[in-house]
Amino acid sequence: GWVWNQFFVPEEMNTTSHHVGRLRSDLDNGNNSFQYKLLGAGAGSTFIIDERTGDIYAIEKLDREERSLYILRAQVIDITTGRAVEPESEFVIKVSDINDNEPKFLDEPYEAIVPEMSPEGTLVIQVTASDADDPSSGNNARLLYSLLQGQPYFSVEPTTGVIRISSKMDRELQDEYWVIIQAKDMIGQPGALSGTTSVLIKLSDVNDNKPIFKESLYRLTVSESAPTGTSIGTIMAYDNDIGENAEMDYSIEEDDSQTFDIITNHETQEGIVILKKKVNFEHQNHYGIRAKVKNHHVDEQLMKYHTEASTTFIKIQVEDVDEPPLFLLPYYIFEIFEETPQGSFVGVVSATDPDNRKSPIRYSITRSKVFNIDDNGTITTTNSLDREISAWYNLSITATEKYNIEQISSIPVYVQVLNINDHAPEFSQYYESYVCENAGSGQVIQTISAVDRDESIEEHHFYFNLSVEDTNSSSFTIIDNQDNTAVILTNRTGFNLQEEPIFYISILIADNGIPSLTSTNTLTIHVCDCDDSGSTQTCQYQELMLSMGFKTE
């Protein structure tokens, strides 16, 4: 049978040939009658065999990491017979390892993110090096990890390559660290090979900083003419955190006047001071408000960093605006009796300059020929007034600052002209009546009514009478209906168209004013020729009357 020991050949041997071992048959008596042959991958190129002795030689430098074993076949032939002495057999040549490979970090580049302020022992990342040497052969591939750069913030577990935090870090001081890790084989013993890698460790932000006002005092100004909602200025706090952790909300901590508000611009993280109520320089010319700022999002476990909100004081100066004069009342109503003489007193309007300088005021009346106003605001008449022409006057009074004529205010002034009894009552219309020649006594000829241009304080009451002459000699009589109307009746039987075709009756109408006024009104009565029924008028003056547009019915 075949006789051999296990074959080993060290890698990386520089000699031209290296004796590996010897193959032989136990039938070989050493008389050189056997011929040994080597077959398989590497036979003849990497390994050769001494055909006579069976000694195997490596003729090439070997690299275990390229190929760690060779499987070859051996044959032995009897030269004399040419027949195989032993059956062909497979054998193995193992390439034995030397420490010719340094550890390599294959997953580079390494990058890790860890929250700032993480406690000691927090796992950051695990780095792993590979050593191509034989892990089963001694310590050639047994690695130890160590930290070359990154103390005192980081540490590495020597056997696992796990990087941990060894000291708390503040992102606001330094936001990233380069850590250099070394891996050594031979468990660090002499002759060890090493490899290094860099790890970029970035600190993610936690909300460990509250926003703080850099300015303890802000000074803003607001015009007293500014409408509510006006932005009067901005304030700004700074937060060393980033992103969501730097988002902040501004609010008013103290403003007894409740005149201002603060809204947050979430894009710029500024506080905008807003006018909530209109200000008046003459009432209050400066304001003080205290503003505070807080983070928008704060985790419960980070509340210790946010106990006391940062505050700032804002001094707001109100800017004076020259305002127009201010009338004491929004409008005035005055009364004056009609027929009072020119220059009569109507009333007084009053306006003042609301500004601090208290400019004198000048008054004027827009487009009025009837009234005048002086610099004291006293309104007088320039003409006698007639209520029956105009009972009310709507005036526009203008007040102008003496020192700034552009500052103008106007208000309406209503003047009521009060009635005096200066008009007697009179016929409400023109009356023209007729009476039939054959009319009997007591026949109603006409109902009359009166009007009075004066205003009635309670109700007008008119009194109707015939004139003294007509009362004594009249063919007609009058009855007062006590309702501001009266009826004219015949006072005799029969009239003669030829003798007396027209009667002119003077009617006295008196009012109930104090003193009472009376007017004399003439009623014209035509005598007509009527048929028996009294309905057909064949009146001498009928055509005349009709052409004038009068009806006689």
């Epitope: 100004t221 304001y287 001094k315």
Partner: antibody, heavy 119, light 107 residues
């Protein structure tokens, strides 16, 4: 320490002019609003004028409006009061005062300078 | 303008006694914008109280201020010899006006 020292007072005839100065030290002059206050002999205090920290705003009491002008020179740390058309009733000790940073009261006063207006 | 009226005009007290000075405003003083000063003869006024009740720097705690709206008071809990002076209230809600003063004299 904060110091305010007034100067420029004296006797002046009615209708004439006078300029008072107030030298400030011991604080950041440009950060504070400054005032003038006067006190007639044997009488109480009367506020006269104020100028804002940056000199952009001035306000006056009605009694001096149009006649007095308040100003400041930050490079010299000095406050001024220019008094024109002086009247007998302007006779008083004139004090300059610093307005509190977080308030409108007067936390520091000078010792005052006397202005006498008489013919 | 806001008119301040102080009372009494003169207060005669002995050292160690309690002094209460009153200041009344003609209209409400916003945000308690009221200060108290004292003035010794020949000296400049000195700020005692601001914001109606806050003591100024270096002012002893025997001085206290109170009030709001239109009625304010300055109390000196126990008069010291150096406290005998003229006391002025001042409003700074709208412009600046002073009261006419209260003289605290030794009885």
């Amino acid at each position: 320490q904060v110091q305010l020292v007034e100067s420029g007072g004296g006797v002046v005839q009615p209708g004439r002019s006078l300029r008072l100065s107030c030298a400030a030290s011991g604080f950041t002059f440009s950060s504070y609003d400054m005032h003038w206050v006067r006190q007639a002999p044997g009488k109480g205090l009367e506020w006269v004028a104020v100028i804002s920290y940056d000199g952009t705003n001035e306000y006056y009491a009605d009694s001096v409006k149009g006649r007095f002008t308040i100003s400041r020179d930050t490079s010299k740390n000095t406050l001024y009061l220019q008094m024109n058309s002086l009247r007998a009733e302007d006779t008083a000790v004139y004090y300059c005062a610093r307005e509190r940073y977080f308030d409108w009261s007067f936390d520091y006063w000078g010792q005052g300078t006397l202005v006498s207006v008489s013919s | 303008e806001i008119v301040l009226t102080q009372s009494p005009g003169t207060l005669s007290l002995s050292p160690g006694e309690r002094a209460t000075l009153s200041c009344r405003a003609s209209q409400s003083v916003s945000n308690t914008y009221l200060a108290w000063y004292h003035q010794r003869p020949g000296q400049a006024p000195r700020l005692l109280i601001y914001g109606a009740s806050s003591r100024a720097t270096g002012i002893p705690d025997r001085f206290s201020g109170s009030g709001s709206g239109t009625d304010f008071a300055l109390t000196i809990s126990s008069l010291e010899p150096e406290d005998f002076a003229v006391y002025y209230c001042q409003q700074y809600s709208n412009s600046w006006t002073f009261g006419q003063g209260t003289k605290v004299e030794i009885k």
